[in-house]
Interface confidence: medium
């Protein structure tokens, strides 16, 4: 990621270590439209957990806990012959780091576990 | 996210409508641990499309698209009773935008299909 | 009805050994993917390591990077235990130990994100206190 941020090599140095970032997110009114309860409806169900801090935008991250290990079948018993297992995603927020009138922002990488699928898993045999 | 990035009101405000974003990213090297290819082991597989971009942050998005409507059966046969649902996630990443040496950046809401689920469908009665 | 009750726990040395005992009333364990999880004072629950089911898969063991080469899981399927053999145990291993059960077959892959998120596990034990101290 230090490449990306730096100048042209032929351009003066960034002072201080920083940059300039501009205000406002584009596109920050899209919004993901997923179908209604998957996580309710999945044979991999999944419950969320809501973090927030007022010092990370976005302020509000939300990760996903696998229900079960196994998965749910049309009869609504767990199979225990298959995994449910978490998707993660690896996100950025931004970290406000604030001294006096001073403020600052960095970037955070986050892992957030999405959902979960169902996956017929990897079975060691024993020799 | 537009009060986030703004001063204490009683602070000078920012010149220029930007602010300061520190060099590096924390937790840079921080990587998703998923099983191994769950994308194919999946009742409801994905296959991945990579896009690059080099000016933005990452400069690769992968985005998941789901192989079926149904889902994969203990036979390995396609079952349309149920469905194959994508499962999205807003990200941010960085948009770096430069004019001769005038390099500045903007925070940009990408939508990232992160893998699929398997879910009961909603079925809408006839009245 | 369904019981597991750890047992084992000492007052032992850094460098010392211990080993717990997990024995389970009520169910047979060969059915059931067996974690032990431990809880330090301030601290959050999290996964020591956990051994899959025999019956529907391989009895396969899983560790965190923490107690590998250390701690050893095994199971006495006769007696419908399971133990945790604990070696070259350190100042960082005192806690509450736990054990837990869960129906099912546990993937080699899954292994971490289980032990991390113990929520799924059905049954669990009271727990038996390890204290390492000089």
């Known amino acids: 990621g230090e490449t990306f941020f730096q100048k042209p090599e032929s351009c003066p140095p960034v002072p201080g270590g920083s940059m300039k970032l501009d205000i406002g997110i584009i596109n920050e009114n899209q919004r993901v439209s997923m179908s209604r309860n998957i996580e309710s409806r999945s044979t991999s169900p999944w419950d969320y957990t809501v973090t927030w801090d007022p010092n990370r935008y976005p302020s509000e991250v939300v990760q996903a806990q696998c229900r079960n290990l196994g998965c749910i079948n049309a009869q609504g018993k767990e199979d225990i012959s298959m995994n449910s297992v978490p998707i993660q995603q690896e996100t950025l927020v931004v970290r406000r780091k604030h001294q006096g009138c001073s403020v600052s922002f960095q970037l955070e990488k986050v892992l957030v576990t999405v959902g979960c699928t169902c996956v017929t898993p990897v079975i060691h045999h024993v020799q | 996210g537009e009060t986030f990035f703004q001063k204490p009101e009683s602070c000078p405000p920012v010149p220029g409508g930007s602010m300061k974003l520190d060099i590096g990213i924390i937790n840079e090297n921080q990587r998703v641990s998923m099983s191994r290819n769950i994308e194919s082991r999946s009742t409801s597989p994905w296959d991945y499309t990579v896009t690059w971009d080099p000016n933005r942050y990452p400069s690769e998005v992968v985005q998941a698209q789901c192989r079926n409507l149904g889902c994969i059966n203990a036979q390995g046969k396609e079952d349309i009773s149920m469905n194959s649902v994508p499962i999205q996630q807003e990200t941010l990443v960085v948009r770096r935008k430069h004019q001769g040496c005038s390099v500045s950046f903007q925070l940009e809401k990408v939508l990232v299909t992160v893998g699929c689920t398997c879910v009961t469908p909603v079925i809408h009665h006839v009245q | 009805q369904v019981q597991l009750v750890e047992s084992g726990g000492d007052l032992v040395q850094p460098g010392g050994s211990l080993r717990l005992s997990c024995a389970a009333s009520?169910?047979?364990?060969?059915?059931?993917?067996i974690g032990w999880f431990r809880q330090a004072p301030g601290k959050e629950r999290e996964g020591v390591a956990c051994?899959?089911?025999?019956?529907?898969?391989?009895?396969?063991?899983y560790y965190v990077d923490s107690v590998k080469g250390r701690f050893t899981i095994s199971r006495d399927n006769a007696k419908n235990t399971v133990y945790l053999q604990m070696n070259s145990l350190k100042l960082e291993d005192t806690a509450v130990y736990y054990c837990?059960?869960?129906?099912?077959?546990?993937?080699?892959?899954?292994?971490?994100?289980?032990?991390?998120?113990?929520?799924?596990?059905?049954?669990w034990g009271n727990g038996t206190l390890v204290t390492v101290s000089s």
């Open positions: 837990a059960a869960e129906r099912g077959r546990i993937d080699p892959d899954v292994a971490g994100y289980f032990l991390r998120e113990s929520y799924v596990m059905d049954y």
């Open positions: 051994i899959s089911s025999i019956s529907n898969s391989d009895g396969r063991a």
């Open positions: 009520g169910f047979t364990l060969d059915d059931y993917v």
